[in-house]
């Protein structure tokens, strides 16, 4: 019989404790949020907030720019200075709650912890490939906010998602807040609303649309807004919230929230509960029926998926797919399975799943005993009846009022458990060439880039490295720019090429051969690298 | 200071295309919104539709299968095509730019005239 | 589509105070239609004076404002001056995505 070379196990043909340096910035304070823009000139930015502070990169993260968002009633505070000469508000420092683009503009809108989460526009101006902040503008007019009703009043000290969706020639910011008794009786940001800027950016316009959490309710019933998108003709936010009103607050679930991006309003809200699983191939005994549930959301990204694992989801190509990275409990702490799992929800099911919900509260015959639900947000009703009515009004209509769906949307782990221990804090999702790549970070400041493929048992690696060598956690806000994708860590923005950060980590030819063509990987006498890295022979053929 | 500035034929033939140029200066079109907007002789203005800091367009539906709205972002102008023009057509063409919901800037206006 | 219908032709003295009205056929104007007036000169020269209701535009003098009144868009001049003799436009914005102009006002500062 021939002999043949023994072969290599998979897992010895990788080192992933092989070290890669990418670009970084070290921002002098935690990161507390991050955009970036890219223009149609070449010209591009990047922005992140820190206490106090908001800095103004170009895309090779060098700086470009500083400027002082606080503390407030600080006279060297220079976005607190265009609001005029204060006090505005008690003293405090700035913690950057919302930094979002207005591309129409375009401009960057940031918005803080301090002055009643108010908000301030900064104009870009290019200059050559690079791009600087215009003076602020407070968009905050005294005169036309109070406690109660304050359509200056966005951000929210507890957190606040916003998404800016162009309607016609309109920009709408769709808003999400959590809150508590004190954020709601101090110039209240109300949990979910739709505002418009004004056109002398003076502020946002009055009489905007909102919903917001019962007074009654605000002390049991509190909601994290984790993540916020717009594809198609909806706006989408994440939640992670206590199960039932009346119910033990700790027992948390994640619930997804629809809104209308074609018209600015609220009565086609509408909710539904995510449910995420991991449903081991062999059950243990004693484990529960459908998998052990992961009901608290951790992270999210929305984007179109590669070939294949469109046809494992029995979607098209290219259709927009939410993923999030789901734990057992707030802490994340450890369980009978993997720390983290994610978990797939194409859109398009989630919005047929919706409608199919909105059908069965609203068309004859109703099921009777099916409740509205959101009571959080509305007085209990049963279906069709709007909230708190025993009846529908002869001009009224179902369908124009809020509505949580009876059912919940399941999925399983797409990785089959085999994230193990990782606790992810950071995802982003690719598609390239026909592969969709998981970029996730991690609670121990690493990067790993993963093919996201349900039907294997082992993980396939773009690359899993370390960003750096304080151990941060990675934060959950990941930015694109270009082929880069920017991860925070502690006080520090890296930016990591979504093609991976190159291919010294595969040990083997063979292995090396075999990645990925977007990887750009080939055999280099003794190592595994890109042209770039090869003075000499590169071969991407065949191995030696 | 934005300045607008509209070129073309003062004389189109029925039946054939009507084209415009406006020329933008001190503000780059991949701001904001563009618009194109008619006076008839007897008073009456049209809007025509738009095209977006983005590219994306929007046309009045009496117009929407006859007109053309294109840009060139290099050049900083942006162009109008209407088919198919009849006499109708004859008026006074103006580009205007809106800035947060306000058509603040205008261009001079140029007048088409549509006759054999 | 809707129609937006002004007065005609109204005449006013200077220093006095006039108000140009706009209706719309599709009920009333509410802030969502953006209102803007627009003004026409002699010379057919265009200017942007007031958007999105109440807003002047740049450059635009304080005696020149905008509001609701009642179910239509309103232009108050106050204070006219023999300047402002001109064509006033109203626009409102519809939810499909575009402007409608109103017929026009010619105003006469005698």
């Known amino acids: 019989e021939d002999w043949q070379c023994p072969r290599t196990p998979y897992a010895a043909s990788r080192d992933f404790d092989v070290k890669y340096v990418v670009p970084s910035f070290s921002a002098g304070g935690l990161v507390q949020a991050m955009v970036t823009y890219e223009g149609d000139r070449n010209e591009s930015a990047v922005f992140v907030a820190i206490r106090n502070r908001l800095h103004v990169l170009g895309p090779d993260l060098k700086s470009v720019q500083s400027l002082a968002t606080g503390p407030a009633g600080d006279p060297g505070c220079q976005t607190c200075a265009a609001c005029g000469p204060g006090p505005h508000g008690p003293p405090g420092d700035t913690d950057t709650k919302v930094l979002v683009l207005d591309p129409a503009l375009p401009a960057l809108v940031s918005c803080g912890s301090s002055l009643q989460g108010r908000c301030f526009l900064h104009d870009l101006e290019p200059q050559g490939t690079a791009v600087h902040l215009a003076a602020p503008a407070c968009l905050f007019s005294a005169h036309h906010n109070r406690p109660d009703d304050c359509p200056d009043c966005v951000a929210s000290p507890l957190g606040t998602r916003v998404t800016v969706v162009e309607q016609g020639q309109a920009s709408y910011f769709y808003v999400a807040s959590s809150l508590d008794a004190a954020v709601a009786a101090s110039f209240s940001p109300r949990s979910v609303s739709i505002r418009r800027l004004k056109a002398d950016a003076s502020g946002f316009a009055p009489g905007f649309v909102a919903l917001s959490v019962l007074p009654k309710h605000l002390v049991s019933y509190s909601i994290e807004y984790v993540h916020s998108f717009h594809t198609g003709a909806f706006v989408y936010f994440l939640t992670v919230q206590p199960a039932s009103v009346t119910d033990d607050p700790s027992a948390l679930h994640t619930r997804l929230a629809r809104l209308s991006a074609t018209e600015p309003e609220l009565g086609d809200y509408r909710e539904l509960v995510l449910d995420c699983r991991f449903a081991p191939k062999r059950r243990r005994r004693g484990a529960p029926e459908g998998g052990q549930p992961y009901p608290v959301l951790r992270v999210a990204h929305s984007a179109p998926v590669g070939a294949q694992l469109a046809t494992e989801l029995s979607i098209a190509e290219g259709q927009e797919v939410l993923f999030g990275v789901f734990v057992t409990g707030k802490d994340g702490g450890p369980g009978v399975g993997p720390n983290s799992v994610v978990c797939a929800f194409p859109i398009d099911l989630l919005d047929t799943l919706i409608d199919e919900g909105v059908e069965r509260c609203c068309e004859s015959p109703v099921h009777p005993g099916l409740r509205r639900g959101l009571d959080f947000f509305q007085s209990p009703s049963f279906c069709p009846n709007p909230p708190g009515l025993e009846a529908l009004s002869p001009n009224t209509s179902c369908r124009h009022f809020p509505l949580l769906v009876s059912s919940s949307f399941s999925r399983v782990d797409l990785f089959n458990g085999l994230l193990g221990p990782v606790q992810v804090t950071a995802l982003y999702v690719t598609r390239l060439d026909n592969v969709t790549v998981a970029h996730m970070g991690t609670m121990d400041g690493r990067i790993l880039q993963v093919e996201l493929v349900r039907s294997l048992n082992y993980l396939l690696y773009v690359s899993n490295f370390s960003l750096g060598d304080s151990g941060q956690p990675v934060q959950r806000d990941v930015s694109r720019l270009g082929d880069h994708l920017l991860f925070a860590s502690g006080d520090q923005v890296f930016q990591v090429p979504i093609q991976g950060p190159g291919c010294r980590h595969f040990l083997t030819c063979g292995r090396c051969l075999r990645a990925w063509h977007f990887m750009g990987c080939g055999w280099c006498g003794n190592m595994c690298g890109q042209q770039k890295e090869c003075p000499g022979s590169w071969q991407q053929d065949h191995c030696p | 200071e934005v300045q607008l500035q509209e070129s073309g034929p003062s004389l189109v033939k029925p039946s054939q295309t009507l084209s415009l140029t406006c020329y933008v200066t001190g503000d780059s079109i991949t701001s904001d919104y563009w618009n194109w907007i008619r006076k008839f002789p007897g008073n009456k203005l049209e809007y025509m539709g738009y095209?977006?800091?983005?590219?994306?367009?929007y046309y009045n539906p009496s117009l929407k299968s006859r007109i053309s709205i294109t840009r060139d972002t290099s050049k900083n102008q942006f162009y109008l095509r209407l088919n198919s023009v009849t006499t109708e057509d004859t008026a006074t063409y103006y580009c205007?730019?809106?800035?947060?919901?306000?058509?603040?800037?205008w261009g001079q206006g140029t007048l088409v005239t549509v006759s054999a | 589509q809707a129609v937006v219908t002004q007065e005609s032709a109204l005449t006013t003295s200077p220093g006095e105070t006039v108000t140009l009205t706009c209706r719309s056929s599709?009920?009333?104007?509410?802030?969502?239609?953006?209102a803007n007036w627009v003004q026409e000169k002699p010379d057919h020269l265009f200017t942007g004076l007031i958007g999105?209701?109440?807003i002047r535009a740049p450059g635009v003098p304080a005696r020149f404002s905008g509001s609701l009144i009642g179910d239509k868009a309103a232009l108050t001049i106050t204070g006219a001056q023999t300047e402002d003799e001109a064509i006033y436009f109203c626009a409102l914005w519809y939810s499909n995505h575009y402007w409608v102009f109103g017929g026009g006002t010619k105003l006469t500062v005698l």
């Open positions: 999105d209701t109440n």
């Open positions: 095209i977006s800091y983005s590219g994306s367009t």
């Open positions: 205007a730019r809106t800035h947060i919901l306000t058509i603040a800037y």
């Open positions: 599709a009920g009333a104007v509410t802030t969502s239609n953006f």
